[in-house]
Interface confidence: medium
């Protein structure tokens, strides 16, 4: 159709090799938000402050780390966005109302063992999937 | 030891399948916070409203949803918390200065077909994955 | 890259309009939106208004009504009708553009390009 060879023809005139969700990712210190970006921040969880000391036996906290920040416009590359989160980015960025921004949530997350009474009080060693945050990105 | 021996007969006070991480889950209506619990919202995405009408020829848009909602304490089952998620909660519930809540992001995510010219203006169809909402959880 | 070019700025009196232009050179036909932000003396920026290649318009509450911003896409050219203008107006008035695309590994915008600025200032 017209509209097609139309659009194909000012297609052209684009510059090459704007590659994928790297795009994004060029404007790295762009000033378009002041607040900090998202990343990993440090938590260590006692199993005491929580209440849990009673029956949790070894260890008696860990390092949970947390995920907090902006995802602003424009994302940089290694804030491991999602496609849908570099679309909502750009939806929020042109019109606010629309829609929140992405959320800063973890990316990669590993396991802990925990020495533990079961409700028959029997000692009980097991692996936790999910606990301690080892990468966060835009969601 | 003395200490955990202690710690067993207290535990056994407790009351009974408080298996580990789901314990945070129980209190499933709990009026603890009036807002919103997370959840996927309707967005339609129109590409002529991004500016890409120009180069991508079908859709002219896609319904892409998004996540919202608060992640409070308790966390309700239905919100795919991890167990991260769940600590993190309990961490805020106890002490909001410590960390914020965990945040409402996309559990599931398909993908779509997008008929588009590339940079000599060939017509590419081509699959993308994660733009589709299809669930949302508490990270 | 993208160059962007502002002009129209002045000084006028309460009441008064202005017209700011802001003309895009470079790598332009990839520019999806394009919008006005300004930043008051001792201010943060904020956004004045924006428009998408598409049409789609927003406007900071504080200038709905007395501004309107307009694009030639021929031209690469977005437009800033300031009618009715106030003390409070007076600013830096700064272009910027949004650049973005598809390819065949995936998703994703380039990022956001900024003018040097026009001086807007507004006397009572």
């Known amino acids: 159709s017209t509209g097609s060879k139309q659009r194909s023809q000012n297609r052209s005139k684009t510059p090459k090799n704007q590659e994928a969700l790297r795009m994004a990712n060029v404007a790295e210190n762009s000033s378009s938000d002041q607040r900090q970006a998202c990343k990993k921040h440090e938590l260590y969880v006692s199993f005491r402050d929580l209440g849990w000391q009673d029956w949790i036996i070894a260890p008696e906290g860990y390092a949970a780390y947390y995920c907090e920040g902006e995802c602003a416009f424009p994302l940089n590359s290694y804030m491991n966005a999602t496609n849908h989160a570099i679309v909502q980015t750009l939806v929020h960025f042109i019109n606010p109302e629309t829609v929140p921004k992405p959320c800063c949530a973890p990316t990669q997350l590993n396991a802990i063992s925990v020495l533990y009474f079961d409700d028959s009080s029997n000692v009980i060693l097991k692996k936790y999937r999910n606990m301690v945050v080892r990468a966060c990105g835009c969601h | 030891s003395t200490g955990s021996k202690q710690r067993s007969q207290n535990r056994s006070k407790t009351p009974k399948n408080q298996e580990a991480l789901r314990m945070a889950n129980v209190a499933e209506n709990s009026s603890s916070d009036q807002r919103q619990a997370c959840k996927k919202h309707e967005l339609y995405v129109s590409f002529r409203d991004l500016g890409w009408q120009d180069w991508i020829i079908a859709p002219e848009g896609y319904a892409a949803y998004y996540c919202e909602g608060e992640c409070a304490f308790p966390l309700n089952s239905y919100m795919n918390a991890t167990n991260h998620a769940i600590v993190q909660t309990l961490v805020h519930f106890i002490n909001p200065e410590t960390v914020p809540k965990p945040c409402c992001a996309p559990t599931q995510l398909n993908a779509i077909s997008v008929l588009y010219f590339d940079d000599s203006s060939n017509v590419i169809l081509k699959k993308y994955r994660n733009m589709v909402v299809r669930a949302c959880g508490c990270h | 890259e993208v160059q962007l070019v502002e002009s129209g700025g002045g000084l006028v009196q309460a009441g008064g309009s202005l017209r700011l232009s802001c003309a895009a050179s470079?790598?332009?036909?990839?520019?999806?939106?394009m919008g006005w932000y300004r930043q008051g003396p001792g201010k943060q920026r904020t956004l004045v208004a924006r428009?998408?290649?598409?049409?789609?318009?927003n406007y900071a509450d504080s200038v709905k009504g007395r501004f309107t911003i307009s694009r030639d896409n021929a031209k690469n050219t977005v437009y800033l009708q300031m009618n009715s203008l106030k003390p409070e107006d007076t600013a830096v008035y700064y272009c910027?553009?949004?650049?973005?695309?598809?390819?065949?590994?995936?998703?994703?915008?380039?990022?956001?390009?900024w003018g040097q600025g026009t001086q807007v200032t507004v006397s009572s």
């Open positions: 470079g790598s332009a036909f990839s520019i999806n939106a």
């Open positions: 428009i998408t290649s598409g049409g789609s318009t």
């Open positions: 910027y553009a949004v650049h973005s695309k598809l390819s065949t590994t995936g998703w994703g915008t380039i990022g956001d390009y």
